[in-house]
């Protein structure tokens, strides 16, 4: 009684570009490719892609990131630090559409959160966010 | 309410866990006014790499 894999990707979203593992469906209302979300596949930072329309995605290789001598969190060989972040949004209500990146509610909330993080960490060093997951509080 | 869980990526050596959390907490008031998001219960931790999408969402259930 097995189902099919969701076919979704974990996407690193930053300023309209994304490092992604597999292609995801075109978003109806977001400026970037469909929002990052958990899937059955591991996260990989494979390539930058810029979504230009519903059917075309342009890829180019990721430039190597500068590695420094001291480490602030577990490292990728490319010199990237990852942090897991969790928080509550108390003035929003969860509903099942927040489990699906093609819904308006998911896309609007993902867009707001992505923009917010770009504001918070606008100093150098911030590469983006990935693996957004919403659940009831 | 909605619990949000995600992974942030930074260039190595530019920030630590404490600073990630501090900067996020400092922005909470602006988040409420600009995005109408009332944020609480912030938690930040390191993510070991290589990691999978499965591995780092077990912090809070």
């Amino acid at each position: 009684a097995s189902g099919s894999a969701s076919g979704s990707a974990s996407t690193l979203v930053h300023n309209g570009t994304s490092a992604r593992a597999t292609t995801t469906p075109a978003s109806k209302s977001t400026p970037f490719s469909i929002p990052s979300h958990h899937s059955d596949t591991p996260t990989t930072l494979a390539s930058h892609s810029t979504k230009t329309d519903a059917s075309s995605t342009h890829h180019s290789s990721v430039p190597p990131l500068t590695s420094s001598n001291h480490s602030t969190s577990p490292q990728l060989s490319t010199g990237v630090s990852f942090f897991f972040l969790s928080f509550h949004i108390s003035n929003l209500q969860f509903n099942s559409s927040l489990e699906d990146p093609s819904t308006d509610y998911y896309q609007e909330l993902q867009r707001d959160i992505s923009e917010m993080f770009l504001q918070i960490y606008k100093q150098g060093g911030f590469l983006g966010l990935s693996n957004i997951k919403f659940r009831p509080g | 309410s909605v619990v949000v869980q995600l992974t942030l990526a930074f260039r190595e050596g530019t920030i630590n866990v404490h600073d990630v959390e501090t900067q996020f907490n400092q922005y909470k008031t602006e988040a409420a006014s600009r995005y109408n998001l009332t944020i609480s219960d912030v938690s930040v931790s390191d993510v070991p790499f290589p990691f999978s999408a499965q591995s780092h969402h077990h912090h809070h259930h």
Partner: antibody, heavy 117, light 107 residues
């Protein structure tokens, strides 16, 4: 491989209740949503409700409100659906479908419930 | 509730034929539409999610598209294992609803 295994067929009397289970395996997340859907003999599919595993968050189709209770047991990775005040028109195959990055990604094999006196 | 009108309710086709099934939504549902395949005695299988994205392991002969409020599932070259019943499903708003189904039979 994600698997959803549903409990076996049930024969129940009108007015009684039935509780069926949907156990998921092959997936390390302990938090995700389960939708319940039914299919009456020779008919199409009908959405019953949704539960987010490991929480008390539920959504119900108004048509079933008051008769359906969705619950879950995170430690057993199992969702349950109880349907009460059964009538003959509740004879159907009941399916669970869970999320996996998006809604309705994986489906169980179904549980046949026969309501008969 | 959002109604999904699926057509045809049944069709007969031969192996190799191109088959098209349509669902019309009574309200705007964006891209929140899945296509499902049901075979007797087997678990339901999702083929297409978010209108046009192919699920992992689903053959590329299956495709989904949208034109306004019309959503289409196309099987480019019907294979023996494709004889089944197909349903569309909208999850734009609760209660989630299904099309009436299309039974694809051997001619």
């Amino acid at each position: 491989e994600v698997q959803l295994v549903q409990s076996g067929a049930e024969v129940v009397k009108p007015g009684a209740s039935v509780k069926m289970s949907c156990k998921t395996s092959g997936y390390t997340f302990t938090s995700y949503g389960i939708n319940w859907v039914r299919q009456r003999p020779g008919q199409g599919l009908e959405w019953i409700g949704y539960i987010y595993l490991g929480s008390d968050y539920t959504e119900y189709n108004e048509k079933f409100k008051g008769r359906v209770t969705l619950t879950s047991d995170t430690s057993a990775s199992t969702a349950y659906m109880e349907l009460s005040s059964l009538r003959s028109e509740d004879t159907a195959v009941y399916y669970c479908a869970r999320s996996g990055g998006s809604l309705f990604a994986y489906w169980g094999q179904g549980t046949l419930v026969t309501v008969s006196s | 509730d959002i109604q999904l009108t699926q057509s045809p309710s049944s069709l007969s086709a031969s192996v190799g034929d191109r088959v098209t099934i349509t669902c019309r939504a009574s309200q705007d549902i964006g891209i929140t539409l899945n296509w499902l395949q049901q075979k007797p005695g087997k678990a339901i299988k999702r083929l297409i999610y978010a209108t046009s994205s192919l699920d992992s392991g689903v053959p590329s002969r299956f495709s989904g598209s949208r034109s306004g409020s019309d959503y289409t599932l196309t099987i480019s070259s019907l294979q023996p294992e494709d004889f089944a019943t197909y349903y569309c499903l909208q999850y734009a708003s609760s209660p989630y609803t299904f099309g009436g189904g299309t039974k694809v039979e051997i001619k």
